[in-house]
Structure formats: C-alpha cells, structure tokens
C-alpha cells in the first residue's frame, strides 16, 4: 500500500470558467491564457499597479479535503517586472500572499479576510520585462507550499495581491494518503502522511453513521510516514436515538428513546408517551396528552387543565368583577394561567358575538395568574356571557373541546354616547343657530343637551354654556367677526356624555349687512 498523491484541485484541467471569487471585483480577473506549452487555459490576472495600498483577494471555490490532512499547493505563475510598467515604481509590487481558511462547508461568496491564515509571501524567481512580452517568453515560476494539519472538512485558498502584475497560470492542490480505519466510532480517512520520515501527523476522525463527536474531545489519531495509525485520542459517541454496538451505532428499540448523544444507553419512554419506531430521540405523547416546546424529552406528557371552579360575579352599572377558584385538575403542570372570553348576547334568540376591542380588562384579559378580573366599558342594559378558561403550557396544542366556567349577566344604566351631526343652520353677526342628532346610544332618557362655546382665541380659558331640551338651539349675544368653538353633549339621569367634536364658526362682520354662509375654519375628531 504505497502512499500516493490525490488531486483535490487542478485549475489547468478545467475547460470551463473557474468562477472563483474576486474581491473587489475590479481586482483579479479570470481570462483565457496560455501555459508554457501554449495550451489554452483559464488564468487569473491582476495588474492594479497605479494605486498604493492594494488589497485584491482571489478565493478558490470550496475545496473538500476528502481524506486529506496535510495539503500541498503548487502554484505556477508569471509576474511582470515593475520596470516594464511606466510611471508606477512607487506603487508596483513584485510579490503576492497565499492564504487559506478552513471550514466544514461552503460559506458562500463573502471573503472574510480576517478569518484567513497566511501560508506565505510568494515572490518570483524570475519576473519578465516587456522585452519578454514581445517574444512571448512567459517566464513561469513554480512554487510549492504545504498546509496542515487540517481539521475541518474543507478549505478555501486565497491569493492576496498588494499591487503586483501577476497571472496565476496553474493552481494544483493535492495530498498524500494513509489508509482508512475505524476507531472509537470514528472513521479515520485516507490521510496525508508526515512531510518528514519521522513525523506524525495528527488527523481528526469522522464519526461513523449516527455518531457525533464528544464535546471538546474530537477523535484524533496519528498517521506515520509509513502509513500506520498510532495513538488514538478522543472519540465519537452515538447520536440521539442510537446506542453503541461494536464499531457502529444501532437505533433504540420500540418503546425506548435517547434524547442526547451524551446519554450512553437508550431509556424507556416517560409516562403517557410511547415510541413505535426504532431510532427515536424522543417519545410521542398519547392521545389527549401533549409536550410543550420547552418541555425536555424526559418529562411525562401532560394535558390541559379542567375548568375553573366556583365562578362568582359582581355588577356595578357597566363594570363586572369576576372571581373563581383554581381547576380541580391542573393537567399535571404547574404553569396554569387564566383567560377571559367576553360575549355580548341578544335579548331574543340568545345569540352571542365576541365583545370587541373596546372592552377593558383589569389587570388583563389573558395570562392572568390571579383568580380575579374586572371587565369595564360594557354597554348599559346589555346581556353578556363571560367564559373563564384555565390554560397551561399545552392548552394551545390541544384540539379537544375547551373546558371553561361561564356566567351570564345584564349590565345597568350608563351615560349617553356622543352627540353627532352638529351643523350650523344660520350665522349672523351676533348669533349662530345650530342643530344636531341625538346620540346613537342614549342609554336612557335624555333630559337635556349642554352647549359649550368660547372664542377660539381664548383657547377654552373662559367658556359659556347653554342648556336646551331640543336638538337645536340659537346662541345669541356673540361678538361680530369672531371665530367661536362649539361643542355639545347629552345628559341623562346616569350622567353626562362626551362632548361632540369641535365646530369652528365665524360670526359675520359688523360692517357687512349682507348674509352669507360662514365656513368651518377647522374640525377635529377627538372630543375634549
């Protein structure tokens, strides 16, 4: 079993575009070129010699290291003598830098320069002048560098140009290998031998099927120059759902599970759960039982709580206080909270609809940890049903019928709602006639309307009021040529309603005897 070179990348062998990543895009450029035998090949060139402080990166595609541990990189390149480039002696360079970056997978198109490890600065043994260009004498430099030991599944090579005029004619990446074995549930792949006769190369193993590395204890062995594996260190352990059997990981049997690779053996399923297939990392819950997302796999499955008990209420006009006792069965959990569902019901058929968002709850409607709540802003003389539901961490997972305690009530009297449709009927020099519509919800018998008015300039510092029983009124003794603000509210035995939106009206000027329609200067929707 002789050690052999295994090719991972050979840019010359690729007929199509290499499509490596160039950053910035104005730096390295892929073009067709000729090798030393004048055979067409894909090359990368850069010649940004005008500006100082160049930092042009070229990154290969992700190279899977396969069975490699120590990598050899062979570069063939040509480098143009700075003297052959006019007027750039201060900024032109004649070296470039070689880097690599190890990853377990393709990390995408971004080159994160700070993650790359420098292998070496590459200088040409021979650069060429313009005289060589004319004769097409491409002085090809060959440099070989070694990377290793590598621990991840693959890597990128990167070439950093700092202001040279270079063509990368060929990039070849290869390794020499030892043969594969399995030890401590780890497969040690065909791997690079040591670069010297006496050297030992540390190699990271790849876990067998259904195994993973033990935390901070990666499986490693040493590959000698003779191709023998020595000194095993670290190990792999069977993944969740599997346990070790010889050099393999076998699945847990039915009614057993293993939730973590850290567990040595499979365990029997917890209460109210089961597994009916092999290789389970967790057990499924029985019908009617559930596991919350935050529940660890080793706890028993649980169910939603029963309904709250002993629901009582107290009504104060349009406010209702509810109080109850905890449910008899908490479902096997200690995270019980309560939520309130309010429904408004009609007088006739007893049909109910959700209350809507204008109802207030103290302290809150859902997530209640205490066993009481106050519901406010209900309609007067209306029928309501309140459902109080106990909820735990698995309630939302259940598809079965909700369990709740319910109570139906009728509210008392409330103040009237806002007056609407305020209009100016007539505007004179010293009087304004207004009309309006009665509130949509009088909530009782309207005893009178109150009109508040003031000069707009006064900004409500001083205002007057006028009371009337009808839905129109004439306000007299006003100043001519003045903007007044008017607001109206309804009054019942239960109290005062909210004022209507402000209405701005300008009385006629004294000089003008002519009647005209005044225009509303402004209007707003929010009552004072």
């Amino acid at each position: 079993q002789a050690a052999k070179e295994v090719l991972l990348l050979d840019s010359k062998a690729q007929q199509t575009e290499l499509e490596w990543i160039s950053s910035p895009p104005s730096g390295w450029e892929e073009i067709s070129g000729l090798d030393e035998n004048y055979t067409p090949i894909r090359t990368y060139q850069v010649c940004q010699v005008m500006e100082p402080n160049q930092n042009n990166w070229l990154r290969t595609n992700w190279i899977s290291k396969g069975n490699a541990q120590r990598i050899f990189v062979e570069l063939k390149f040509t480098l143009r003598d700075c003297n052959s480039l006019p007027g750039v002696l201060g900024t032109c360079k004649e070296t470039f830098n070689l880097y690599y970056y190890e990853t377990d997978y393709d990390t995408g198109r971004n080159i994160r320069e700070n993650l790359y490890v420098k292998i070496d600065t590459i200088a040409a043994d021979e650069s060429f002048t313009q005289g060589d260009l004319g004769e097409r004498k491409m002085k090809l430099n060959t440099e070989v560098r070694e990377i290793g030991p590598l621990s991840k599944k693959g890597f990128y090579l990167a070439f950093q140009d700092v202001g040279a005029c270079i063509a990368l004619v060929s990039v070849k990446v290869y390794y020499k290998k030892c043969w594969s074995i399995v030890e401590n549930l780890a497969v040690f792949p065909d791997t690079v031998t040591g670069s010297e006769f006496s050297s030992l190369v540390e190699v990271r193993g790849t876990c067998v099927s259904s195994a993973e590395e033990e935390a901070e204890n990666s499986p490693r062995m040493h590959c000698s120059a003779e191709g023998e594996w020595l000194v095993p260190i670290g190990k792999c352990i069977c993944k969740a759902g599997y346990q070790q059997k010889g050099d393999t990981c076998e699945p847990c049997g039915r009614r057993f599970y293993k939730s973590s690779s850290q567990d040595l053996q499979c365990s029997r399923c917890p209460t109210h759960s089961f597994s009916d297939r092999e290789g389970s990392s967790r057990c499924e819950c029985e019908d009617g039982y559930y596991r919350a997302p935050s529940d660890p796999p080793y706890v028993a499955c649980t169910r939603p709580p029963s309904a709250p008990q002993n629901l009582i209420f107290n009504i104060n006009q349009t406010t209702v206080s509810l109080e109850w006792s905890p449910p008899a069965d908490n479902g096997g959990r200690n995270d019980v909270t309560y939520r309130i569902l309010c429904k408004r019901c009609s007088w006739e058929q007893g049909e109910c609809v959700p209350c809507g968002s204008n109802i207030g709850y103290m302290p809150q409607q859902t997530g209640l940890e205490d066993n009481y709540v106050t519901v406010m802003d209900l309609l007067a003389h209306a029928n309501y049903t309140f459902e109080v539901e106990a909820v735990n961490g698995v309630s939302d997972l259940s598809r079965s019928q909700r369990l709740f305690a319910a109570v139906s009530i009728t509210t008392g009297q409330a103040a009237p709602s806002q007056v609407s449709g305020v209009m100016k009927e007539r505007v004179l020099q010293r009087s304004v006639q207004l009309s309006w519509q009665e509130p949509e919800h009088p909530n009782g018998v309207i005893t009178e309307y109150e009109i508040k008015y003031y000069e707009k300039d006064q900004r409500e510092r001083t205002y007057s009021t006028l009371k009337t029983k009808s839905t129109s009124a004439s306000i007299n003794n006003l100043k001519p040529g003045t903007v007044y603000v008017f607001q109206i509210r309804a009054v019942t035995a239960a109290g005062y309603g909210n004022y209507s939106p402000r209405l701005d009206v300008a009385t006629l000027e004294e000089a003008s005897g002519k009647m005209f329609e005044a225009t509303a200067v402004s209007s707003e929707q929010n009552p004072v």
């Epitope: 060139q45 005008m50 500006e51 097409r136 005029c165 063509a167």
Partner: antibody, heavy 121, light 106 residues
Framework: QVQLLQSGAEVKKPGASVKVPCKAS????????MSWVRQAPGQGLEWMGW????????TYAQGFTGRFVFSLDTSVSTAYLQISSLKAEDTAVYYC??????????????WGQGTLVTVSS | EIVLTQSPATLSVSPGERATLSCRAS??????PAWYQQKPGQAPRLLIY???TRATGIPDRFSASGSGTDFTLTISRVEPEDFAVYYC????????FGQGTKVEIK
C-alpha cells in the same frame, strides 16, 4: 457601468485656449491611468500621452509638449486636457481613454465619446 | 520612435470570408500590439491586448498572432458588423498607433 463622459464640441479662435473635461464613473478613478488620443478629420489615431491618476504625474508623447497640459480633479473623478495657443492644425476629435495594464500587455479599454475642437478665425 | 505600418490600407472582403490584417514595426518591439476597431462617428474599441487576450465582449472570431516586427489580426469569418477601420498600437515606453486598415464590403 464604466463610462467616460466628455463635453460637447468647442469652436475656438487661433491663439485661444480650450480645456476638455473627461468625467469617469463606474470605477475607482485613481486606480487606472488616463490616456489622451487625437484624431484629425479623416486621419488616424495619435497617442498624445497619459496621466497617472493616482500621483497626477503626466507623460507626454513626442510633439505634444509645451502647449498641451494634462490635469486632474480627483474629487469629481475628472481628467482634463488643456490646449493653449490654439492653431488651425489642432482641429481634431480629442478622446480620453482608460489605460489597462495587464501581465501580458497593455491597452486602452474604455473610451470617451470624443470632443471635437474646431480652431477657426 | 517606433513606426507601425499597417497593410493593406483597404481590405475588401465578403461577409463570411477570412480577413487578415498586417501590422509591421520599424524595429523589433518589446511587446505585442493591442488592436482597436473604429466605426464611423464612434470612438475606438479595444479588441485584443497582451498579444492574444480578447477584451471583454469581443467574439472569438477575432484573434492575433506574431512576434518581433510582424503582427497579424485575423477575423475568421467576417460579419456585417465587422466592417470598420482597425488600428494596431504598440505600448513600449512611448505608445504609437498604425495608420489603420479599412475593412470594407467587397
């Protein structure tokens, strides 16, 4: 995209001066040198010289020293060609062209649309 | 100063035919020339630089060869859009253009 934008045609009297701008966009102005090329009516191309846009250092071809001056305003990515003491034989289209250095040789890879300068009394 | 001489001054070809344009230097030049195409009323366009590298977007029917003093631009199959004037240009310490070859429809 990469563009070099030159000004419109100029008509000048003999002895006068003209300053032809060349505004670059779509790339880092100071990363590439700028050449100037003259083409008299019905004639071929004449290389006038080039300017290092990074250092501002100009190089003039034979026959284009003295009255011809290359300059830059890097803040607006613009190169200028100034011709003083204009003569009738200066009547031509003047092109700016971005210089491309490569490992295997050089060339001018992006050209302005040209500015026609007519010198007539 | 190196003088570049292009021949012929005018080349008449039919579409689909091969066109061979010559560029001769007055002395051995230190670099292969660049080649440009210019159509009436337009700026020149870079075709080939660095002896044989085609500029971006230039079709592969254009190729260049030669060394020392004799250089050639070849259009393998002339397309209707290829009828134009072609210039060679050397880029030693001082750059110079040839006087141009006009490729016209036969």
């Amino acid at each position: 995209q990469v563009q070099l934008l030159q000004s419109g045609a100029e008509v000048k009297k003999p002895g006068a001066s003209v300053k032809v701008p060349c505004k670059a966009s779509g790339y880092t102005f100071t990363s590439r040198a700028m050449s100037w090329v003259r083409q008299a009516p019905g004639q071929g191309l004449e290389w006038m010289g080039w300017i290092n846009t990074n250092t501002g250092n100009p190089t003039y071809a034979q026959g284009f020293t003295g009255r011809f001056v290359f300059s830059l305003d890097t803040s607006v990515s613009t190169a200028y060609l100034q011709i003083s003491s204009l003569k009738a034989e200066d009547t031509a289209v003047y092109y700016c062209a971005r210089v491309r250095f490569t490992v295997y040789g050089d060339g001018m890879d992006v050209w302005g649309q040209g500015t026609l300068v007519t010198v007539s009394s | 100063e190196i003088v570049l001489t292009q021949s012929p001054a005018t080349l008449s070809v039919s579409p689909g035919e091969r066109a061979t344009l010559s560029c001769r230097a007055s002395q051995s030049v230190s670099s292969n020339p660049a080649w440009y195409q210019q159509k009436p009323g337009q700026a020149p366009r870079l075709l080939i630089y660095g002896a044989s590298t085609r500029a971006t977007g230039i079709p592969d029917r254009f190729s260049a060869s030669g060394s020392g003093t004799d250089f050639t631009l070849t259009i393998s199959r002339v397309e209707p859009e290829d009828f134009a004037v072609y210039y060679c240009q050397q880029y030693g310490p001082s750059w110079t253009f040839g006087q141009g070859t006009k490729v016209e429809i036969k």
